[in-house]
């Protein structure tokens, strides 16, 4: 998930040279930007979130807000400061004319301004309920730990907290920030107002139909009786959670956001801040049968984004739409005809569908995992959710063709035991946004702050790419893929792993002069090879084939085309051991795979040779996939021969630590 690559509308209003009477001019050369929702009907012009630079203090935020009001008044405009943000993001929420945007963008400390927009409950039909008999049986499901050490915050509609399913489990906070309902004839019927939130609270912690039956919940009302809210209301809700956390630190916190709006830079930024404060955020991918990266908070990289599947593990269709998909989705979960508490009566049940229900399942699973292991970080939790998911059960034909490779084929499941997974080396695959088609376009994939980038690969549907390389950015390694002339764009694919006490570096060999090809190995004592990348400047690598198999006794070596620079990811970590596994096919084939065996984790995936008919390589769970151009276009020349190279690792140190715990 890449929040910076979201497809949203950005209007950059250039700063004029005159200072318009400001006491402090903005820093030289910086331009504050204006953002608004790309989905026109969801825009809420007239209300703006003014986000200030990171270090801005509350007093400066208040001063900036007052300055805006004063300058607006001088121009004859009325403004109203609705909220001053602090705790998560510095800034303020202002009601004003759009005519004042240029003025506001020139204020000191302003980073960017975002027009407010709508967010929506992600269940269908959440107010056209199909009532099931008021009895529901879940005799089989008796979880080992009901999530009793965890508090789950639910940002949703109002809820009926004394429903038998959730009585005593949900504390309704006094937080409420919702827009007026649409329509003059709207009739506020309590049971409908509570429908969405009550159902989701039941899915998370309901006594009969809940996932984490022991979890306690707190609800914040950010959606009105029509299931509609605002980005600003959600932001203020997230800020409320952060302040509550600071005032009264408790155990692990999970925040469930069963809502979606258009891509929002500010909502994603707030989610990032809260996640970095140790809170686990789980959100609905959205019910728009679209790329989840176009929606927020689904597109926030730090949030666990959940798509919906049905009882047959197929993506959920919701009327003419359905679950969102794509690289911003972390995993899927049950989201069709989910039985849960109905606000129609205190013992009623109803089935609802949508990515909200799927997200509620994952929030419940997360609560149980955190209750069993309260010290888990967000990165560790996400890796475990992925690790314990059912793999490759979703029929990908439902997704648009260009999204299939990007969408994780994972359906959330409870771990067989909530303990004892500590020994595993966990890795996941992170896809970048598409680079775009320009000649010099690049795409960047990054790992989470406490994950290690162990390898980097690239993929292009046209095959026109110039490989990939690992490079340092802000003190962390990132994976960058390069487009080639005439290419339709590339993806960078990062393999992100949990490797405590790791010390990783990249060793590079420039293109070789000799015809033997380029080689690079890990020469530092105790460092093992975790991944190989290759990058070339030439538009089209020739048909030169390096020797595919490494010389014996050279497992720590990357081999590549002589015209390519080769990059080896070399890591030192306690007990880390890795081995190279290759699968070569002499005849041309569209896909070659090689998998790591039980107990080993795939850290690196690359292709040999790196010639132009190879579209790229990427990891799917523990399998390295190398894709080549359509056989019919390649012909059956020897150039068609491709080898998939997997690097499989395990950590004896983690295994020992786990055994000692047991």
């Amino acid at each position: 998930q890449e929040d910076e690559d979201g497809d949203y509308e950005e209007l950059v209003l250039a700063l004029r040279s005159e200072e318009d009477g400001l006491a402090e001019a903005p820093e030289h050369g910086t331009t504050a930007t204006f953002h608004r929702c790309a989905k026109d009907p969801w825009r809420l012009p007239g209300t703006y979130v003014v986000v200030l630079k990171e270090e801005t203090h509350l007093s400066q935020s208040e001063r900036t807000a007052r300055r805006l009001q004063a300058q607006a008044a001088r121009r004859g405009y009325l403004t109203k400061i609705l909220h001053v943000f602090h705790g998560l993001l510095p800034g303020f929420l202002v009601k004003m004319s759009g005519d004042l945007l240029e003025l506001a963008l020139k204020l000191p400390h302003v980073d960017y301004i975002e027009e407010d927009s709508s967010v929506f409950a992600q269940s269908i039909p959440w107010n056209l309920e199909r009532i099931t008999p008021p009895r529901y049986r879940a005799d089989e499901y008796q979880p080992p730990d009901g999530g009793s050490l965890v508090e789950v915050y639910l940002l949703d509609t109002s809820i009926q907290s004394d429903h038998r399913e959730i009585e005593g489990r949900v504390m309704v906070t006094d937080f409420e920030n919702v827009p007026e309902e649409d329509g003059t004839r709207f009739h506020r019927q309590a049971s409908k107002c509570d429908s969405h939130g009550t159902h989701l609270a039941g899915v998370v912690s309901g006594r009969d139909a809940g996932v984490a039956k022991g979890a306690s919940m707190r609800s914040l009302r950010v959606l009105n009786c029509q299931g509609k809210g605002t980005v600003s209301g959600t932001l203020i809700g997230l800020e409320f959670i952060r302040k509550s956390q600071l005032v009264q630190p408790v155990g692990p916190l999970v925040v469930l956001l069963p809502l979606a709006g258009g891509y929002s830079r500010v909502l994603n930024a707030a989610c990032q801040r809260l996640a970095r404060a140790g809170v686990v955020l789980v959100t609905a991918a959205g019910n728009f049968r679209d790329d989840a990266c176009l929606y927020s908070p689904a597109s926030a990289p730090e949030v666990i984004t959940v798509g919906a599947t049905n009882a047959q593990d197929q993506p959920v269709t919701l009327g003419t739409l359905g679950t969102n998909f794509g690289r911003c989705v972390d995993l899927f979960a049950p989201g069709e005809d989910i039985i849960g508490a109905s606000s129609d009566c205190s013992t009623c049940f109803v089935s609802q569908s949508g990515t909200s229900q799927a997200a509620a399942h994952v929030a419940g699973i997360a609560a149980m995992m955190l209750s069993a292991e309260p010290e888990l970080t967000l990165a560790e939790l996400r890796q475990r959710l992925i690790h314990f998911s059912a793999k490759d059960v979703i029929n990908e034909a439902w997704f648009p063709e260009d999204q299939r490779v990007l969408t994780p084929n994972l359906v959330a499941a409870l771990p067989p035991s909530t303990h004892g997974a500590g020994w595993q080396l966990f890795c996941r695959t992170v896809w970048s946004a598409h680079s775009g088609p320009t000649r010099m376009a690049t795409a960047v994939a990054r790992c989470a702050p406490d994950e290690e980038l162990l390898s980097c690969s690239s993929f292009s549907r046209s095959g026109k790419r110039r490989g990939e390389r690992m490079e340092a950015q802000g003190g962390k390694l990132v994976c960058r893929a390069h487009n080639a002339f005439g290419g339709e764009g590339v993806y960078a694919i990062a393999r992100c792993c949990l490797l405590p006490q790791a010390n990783c570096s990249v060793h590079t060999a420039p293109p070789a002069e000799a015809s033997m090809g380029t080689r690079v190995h890990c020469h530092q004592q105790g460092h093992v090879l975790t991944g190989c990348s290759s990058h070339w400047e030439v538009e089209d690598l020739g048909t030169h084939k390096p020797p595919v198999l490494r010389p014996r006794g050279q497992p720590n070596q990357c081999v590549g085309h002589r015209e390519a620079s080769i990059h080896a990811s070399c890591c030192h970590a306690p007990g880390l051991e890795c081995k190279v596994k290759e699968h070569g096919i002499p005849a041309p084939q569209e896909q070659v795979t090689v998998a790591c065996e039980e107990g080993w984790t795939l850290t690196g995936c690359s292709a040999l040779p790196g010639t132009s008919h190879v579209l790229g390589a990427y990891a799917v769970d523990n399998t390295c996939v190398v894709r080549s151009r359509d056989v019919s276009t390649t012909g059956s020349t020897s150039e068609g021969a491709v080898t998939a190279v997997a690097i499989c690792c395990r950590s004896r140190h983690l295994a020992q630590a786990s055994q000692e715990l047991q």
Partner: antibody, heavy 115, light 107 residues
Framework: QVQLVQSGAEVKKPGASVKVSCKAS????????ISWVRQAPGQGLEWMGW????????NYAQKLQGRGTMTTDPSTSTAYMELRSLRSDDTAVYYC????????WGQGTTVTVSS | DIQMTQSPSSLSASVGDRVTITCRAS??????LNWYQQKPGKAPKLLIY???TRPTGVPSRFSGSGSGTDFTLTISSLQPEDFATYYC?????????FGQGTKVEIK
């Protein structure tokens, strides 16, 4: 601490009505409804119904339908149970208890129906 | 309605005895069963919640077990203050229903 405090004993004539109150304290009242349970002299316990502090929803036992009304006043955290057309077999101790789980009980209110 | 059948209806025991009371539901109630102790002129007091969970303040000599339709309340070593009437109650479905009670008397 969590407490349910009920109103005092009542003596009523057959055909009259009685209204028993139950004041809740020490917890978030909207997180639980109130159940009413009665116990005739020397007999067992009988659940009469449930009422919501949150929205006033009710769930009555069939036996009570039509004669009993349960209400709440969230502003004072008080629940009420009114029983109309009293008969001698309504003589009992009436208890309020928290939620459906009946984990906390009031001290009981004795209602005597006698001509 | 779900019927709850308690046995025995009364028993005589001495201080220090191990006492077992059983409760059977007419249909599966999962583990949504509570046990109460009631002394004359007093309100029932919750002893066991959800078939086996002992609330804070309830002595450890009281324990509950069972799930589905068959449940047991055990007093491992009867104390003088334990002589009372014990009720089981299901809250799996409404109406909530009680067993007829078991009176524990001094032998």
């Amino acid at each position: 601490q969590v407490q349910l405090v009920q109103s005092g004993a009542e003596v009523k004539k057959p055909g009259a009505s009685v209204k028993v109150s139950c004041k809740a304290s020490g917890y978030t009242v909207t997180s639980y409804g109130i159940s009413w349970v009665r116990q005739a002299p020397g007999q067992g316990l009988e659940w009469m119904g449930w009422v919501s502090f949150y929205n006033g929803q009710t769930n009555y036992a069939q036996k009570l339908q039509g004669r009993g009304t349960m209400t709440t006043d969230p502003s004072t955290s008080t629940a009420y149970m009114e029983l109309r057309s009293l008969r001698s077999d309504d003589t009992a101790v009436y208890y309020c208890a928290r939620g459906y789980s009946l984990d906390v009980w009031g001290q009981g209110t004795t209602v005597t129906v006698s001509s | 309605d779900i019927q709850m059948t308690q046995s025995p209806s009364s028993l005589s025991a001495s201080v220090g005895d191990r006492v077992t009371i059983t409760c059977r539901a007419s249909q599966n109630i999962n583990n949504w069963l509570n046990w109460y102790q009631q002394k004359p002129g007093k309100a029932p007091k919750l002893l066991i919640y959800g078939a086996s969970t002992r609330p804070t303040g309830v002595p450890s000599r009281f324990s509950g077990s069972g799930s589905g339709t068959d449940f047991t309340l055990t007093i491992s070593s009867l104390q003088p203050e334990d002589f009372a009437t014990y009720y089981c109650q299901q809250w799996d479905d409404t109406p909530n229903t009680f067993g007829q009670g078991t009176k524990v008397e001094i032998k």
